[in-house]
Amino acid sequence: IINGSDCDMHTQPWQAALLLRPNQLYCGAVLVHPQWLLTAAHCRKKVFRVRLGHYSLSPVYESGQQMFQGVKSIPHPGYSHPGHSNDLMLIKLNRRIRPTKDVRPINVSSHCPSAGTKCLVSGWGTTKSPQVHFPKVLQCLNISVLSQKRCEDAYPRQIDDTMFCAGDKAGRDSCQGDSGGPVVCNGSLQGLVSWGDYPCARPNRPGVYTNLCKFTKWIQETIQANS
């Protein structure tokens, strides 16, 4: 997250970290069910671990943390590497979470976002770009949803209805390492960090997010079929 600020503790209990061994964070994710996460399809790895209820980036033990294995990862069948359409994936955890003030699911919004909606994006991704500098704790950033026209103008022939753009002033954006993390609007999960320009936070080059309102049926049916 570029030019965000430290999230208040306990305010993002649905935020998950996907880790490669030994403790290398490579993507964010979102708890949407007691045993299921959503993340970006481009975050798929065969071997990874899931950390929930953790505030700092470092692997130091925190009393609220819960660790999991992913037993099943189900990318949306319409995703096409290295493209960006349908960039979402469900991950089934090896057990249900223990609900606490630090670990709690969030509902996926069934309403599509309208331009001007205020949202919050969070993650442990780099705080500088093109340099790489990772934060000590989870970062939060207020962003506004842009109109689909402004989104298409920013990225001609690259935007479809499975994506939406959001941003703020130049210099504020999600970035590498935030992928798969949540965009929360009006208390519901509206999007996942998907892609954007490089370097991040360039003027008139907003962040692009998976438009989850288009996928509520697929999410529900996939969870039911695999529970």
Epitope: K45, K46, V47, Q69, H81, P82
Partner: antibody
Framework: EVQLQESGPGLVKPSGTLSLTCAVS????????MSWVRQPPGKGLEWIGD???????DYASWAKGRVTISQDSSKNQVSLKLSSVTAADTAVYYC???????????WGQGTLVTVSS | AYDMTQSPSSLSASVGDRVTITCQAS??????LAWYQQKPGKAPKLLIY???TLASGVPSRFSGSGSGTDFTLTISSLQPEDFATYYC????????????FGGGTKVEIK
């Protein structure tokens, strides 16, 4: 050097159990999923199953109930057991490492197991 | 089931030819497809993963494309060392799968 080496009896009697081990060197099992694949003489590749560092195991549908895959991280080895074998299980058996992007990037040299009385 | 069908099962070609092998999945596997090359008496070798990403050390004459159900392996200019059997493998799911591999395509000298 990253290396995989399968070993086990080359001959197994019908209705017996085929047991193979895959010795892993040059990388820790804790970081990778491992696969077993077989190839009957003159035929194509057949996936048997995968084992993850967390000991989660996925088997081919034909192998469920007959195959057991396990690992010993302290010895850095993976094992395959196939019970109630018949002549149709005669094949070269390979272990392989997944590159974490769903491609098998390191393979053992394979070991031929013949099922015959 | 996610069945993988390769075609052709064999083909004859000359050095320098452009060769195309196809792999079709019975359901969408998104981009989780790998290609392997196998020579007689040897273990398979990974060529391409994620449908189009070239594995380390693989010559650039090999390329992969496709997504969903239809995939292609192309050898832009066939070399003598490329005569072998090629297999595709899906990595989209391991659940209730008979075989993740396609049946293979043997590339022979014309």
């Amino acid at each position: 050097e990253v290396q995989l080496q399968e070993s086990g009896p080359g001959l197994v009697k019908p209705s017996g159990t085929l047991s193979l081990t895959c010795a892993v060197s040059g990388f820790p099992l804790s970081n990778y999923a491992m696969s077993w694949v077989r190839q009957p003489p003159g035929k194509g590749l057949e996936w048997i199953g995968d084992i993850y560092p967390s000991d989660i195991i996925d088997y081919a549908s034909w192998a469920k109930g007959r195959v057991t895959i396990s690992q010993d991280s302290s010895k850095n080895q993976v094992s395959l057991k196939l019970s109630s074998v018949t002549a149709a299980d005669t094949a070269v058996y390979y272990c392989a490492r997944d590159n974490n992007d769903y491609g098998l990037d390191i393979w053992g040299q394979g070991t031929l197991v013949t099922v015959s009385s | 089931a996610y069945d993988m069908t390769q075609s052709p099962s064999s083909l004859s070609a000359s050095v320098g030819d452009r060769v195309t092998i196809t792999c079709q999945a019975s359901q969408s596997i998104s981009s989780w497809l790998a290609w392997y090359q196998q020579k007689p008496g040897k273990a398979p070798k990974l060529l391409i993963y994620l449908a189009s990403t070239l594995a380390s050390g693989v010559p650039s004459r090999f390329s992969g494309s496709g997504s969903g159900t239809d995939f292609t392996l192309t050898i832009s200019s066939l070399q003598p060392e490329d005569f072998a059997t090629y297999y595709c493998q899906q990595g989209y799911t391991d659940s209730n799968i008979i075989n993740t591999f396609g049946g293979g395509t043997k590339v022979e000298i014309k």
